[in-house]
């Protein structure tokens, strides 16, 4: 899913207030819902009919530093006999997410949001058939 | 996938620099990669063997204001005949993502990152069989 562009009013103060300095805002360092629970089924990446592998990218100047990307293992899907069926398609499910980028200039540290496209997993679909002719 | 807790050093300046005021940092208002392209297949939510619906939540004090959540349509998966097969399971694929929360106190505006758990889509899996003793 695609994150829309940030509205120009999002970083502004209410109309009745003095304007904010252009270009930067105050970011509180805590994170809301930091202890939130992900309740994904066990090993769905290997049990799926469109299985996938994970690779991890690491960047110490990004939060989260670790971003995990899925790659579909097959072109087709795994059928009930455990064989690949290429009349179906394993396709990636992608999600735009935000990360926080840390920027250093000498002793000045600032932060900026960054959009990252994450492949979260794969699903098995009936392909769009463009009939021969 | 779960986002780890933010390390206590992430918001700190380099050791040789004077310490930063406790609790807040400078956030640049631009967004890196704002025009990034999501290349999801057409209508995969309806073409999947584990199809899903989308619902949208809206919050004007959050960026992105719109967060889309998927819900699997079925307990089972759709077979080659278009019928639900409950020997397989449609399961949600979840992803922890960050959003930016805007907080007002009078004319003071600050921002804080918030973790949100998003169900991005569904995949069809072989169920974990718990054998009857």
């Amino acid at each position: 899913r695609k994150i829309p562009k940030v509205g120009h009013t999002f970083f502004q103060k209410p109309e009745s207030c003095p304007p904010v300095p252009e270009g930067s805002m105050k970011l509180d360092t805590g994170i809301i819902n930091e202890n939130q629970r992900v309740s994904m089924s066990r090993n769905i990446e290997s049990r799926s009919t469109s299985p996938w592998n994970y690779t991890v990218t690491w960047d110490p100047n990004r939060y989260p530093s670790e971003v995990v990307q899925a790659q579909c293992k097959h072109l087709g899907c795994i059928n009930a006999q455990g064989k690949e069926d290429i009349s179906m398609n394993s396709v990636p499910i992608q999600q735009e997410t935000l990360v926080l980028r840390r920027k250093h200039q000498g002793c000045s540290v600032s932060f900026q949001l960054e959009k990252v496209l994450v492949t979260v997993g794969c699903t098995c679909v009936t392909p769009v058939v463009h009939h021969v002719q | 996938r779960k986002i780890p807790k933010v390390g206590h050093t992430f918001f700190q300046k380099p050791e040789s620099c004077p310490p930063v005021p406790e609790g807040s940092m400078k956030l640049d208002t631009g967004i890196i990669n704002e025009n990034q392209r999501v290349s999801m297949s057409r209508n995969i939510e309806s073409r999947s063997t584990s199809p899903w619906n989308y619902t949208v939540t809206w919050d004007p004090n959050r960026y992105p204001s719109e967060v889309v959540q998927a819900q699997c349509k079925h307990l089972g998966c759709i077979n080659a005949q278009g019928k639900e097969d409950i020997s397989m399971n449609s399961v949600p694929i979840q992803q922890e993502t960050l959003v930016l929360r805007r907080k007002h106190q009078g004319c003071s505006v600050s921002f804080q990152l918030e973790k949100v758990l998003v169900t991005v889509g569904c995949t069809c899996v072989t169920p974990v069989v718990h054998h009857v003793q």
């Epitope: 579909c72 097959h74 072109l75 087709g76 059928n79 009930a80 064989k83 690949e84 069926d85 290429i86 009349s87 398609n89 394993s90 396709v91 990636p92 392909p127 769009v128 058939v129 463009h130 009939h131 021969v132 | 290349s39 297949s41 077979n79 080659a80 005949q81």
Partner: antibody, heavy 118, light 112 residues
């Protein structure tokens, strides 16, 4: 008009690798799978594998699984087939072939002759 | 792997006469979705193969109606109602129901 244009003939030594390209035109490149099929001199057809140009996902014939790599460059509408650890029995014409799901291999490239000889 | 067996391996036909090629698969080619992914190709001398018939009996665009396909399960037939000189070459049956995709060994058609 649909076209699949392959790279030119190659002569390789045993143990080397070869990379054959196939440039597609005349249709929406990401809408169709592309297969690689080979034909040894005077012999029949042998399927090597298939790639989905949109995702780069592949399905390989187990016979070639450890030696073949299929890749895609969507910016140039080109797919590549690399075969490593070449032996004399890999001497063949290699075809890239468009594939419409479950229908059939409808359009074939002109073929690329790969000769493996010491 | 599915083995595709063609017969005869060669045939010589007088122009205007019919011809028939048989193809047998080692397993059923009926997919769980109900389709049968059995196809026929012709490779003319010095050319890449070309699609004639897809999914048992569907003629590809531009293929003359003297070519027809039939069969089900494991037994399939390609018929040419009246052979013409331009029909010479090697005919292959192929299946794409199961991975890996496989081809028959080919049937060489010559003109008498």
């Amino acid at each position: 008009q649909f076209q699949l244009v392959q790279s030119g003939a190659e002569v390789k030594k045993p143990g080397a690798s070869v990379k054959v390209s196939c440039k597609a035109s005349g249709y929406t490149f990401t809408d169709y799978n592309l297969n690689w099929v080979r034909q040894a001199p005077g012999k029949g057809l042998e399927w090597m594998g298939v790639i989905h140009p949109d995702y780069g996902t592949t399905s390989y014939n187990q016979k070639f699984k450890d030696r073949v790599t299929m890749t895609v460059d969507t910016s140039t509408s080109t797919v590549y087939m690399e075969l490593s650890s070449l032996r004399s029995e890999d001497t063949a014409v290699y075809y890239c072939v468009r594939y419409d799901y479950g229908d059939a291999m409808d359009y074939w490239g002109q073929g690329t002759l790969v000769t493996v000889s010491s | 792997d599915i083995v595709m067996t063609q017969s005869p391996l060669s045939l010589s036909v007088t122009p205007g006469q019919p011809a028939s090629i048989s193809c047998r698969s080692s397993q059923s080619l009926v997919h769980s979705n109900g389709n049968t992914y059995l196809h026929w190709y012709l490779q003319k001398p010095g050319q890449p193969p070309q699609l004639l018939i897809y999914k048992v009996s569907n003629r590809f665009s531009g293929v003359p109606d003297r070519f027809s396909g039939s069969g089900s399960g494991t037994d399939f037939t390609l018929k040419i109602s009246r052979v013409e000189a331009e029909d010479v070459g090697v005919y292959y049956c192929s299946q794409s129901t199961h991975v890996p995709l496989t081809f028959g060994q080919g049937t060489k058609l010559e003109i008498k």
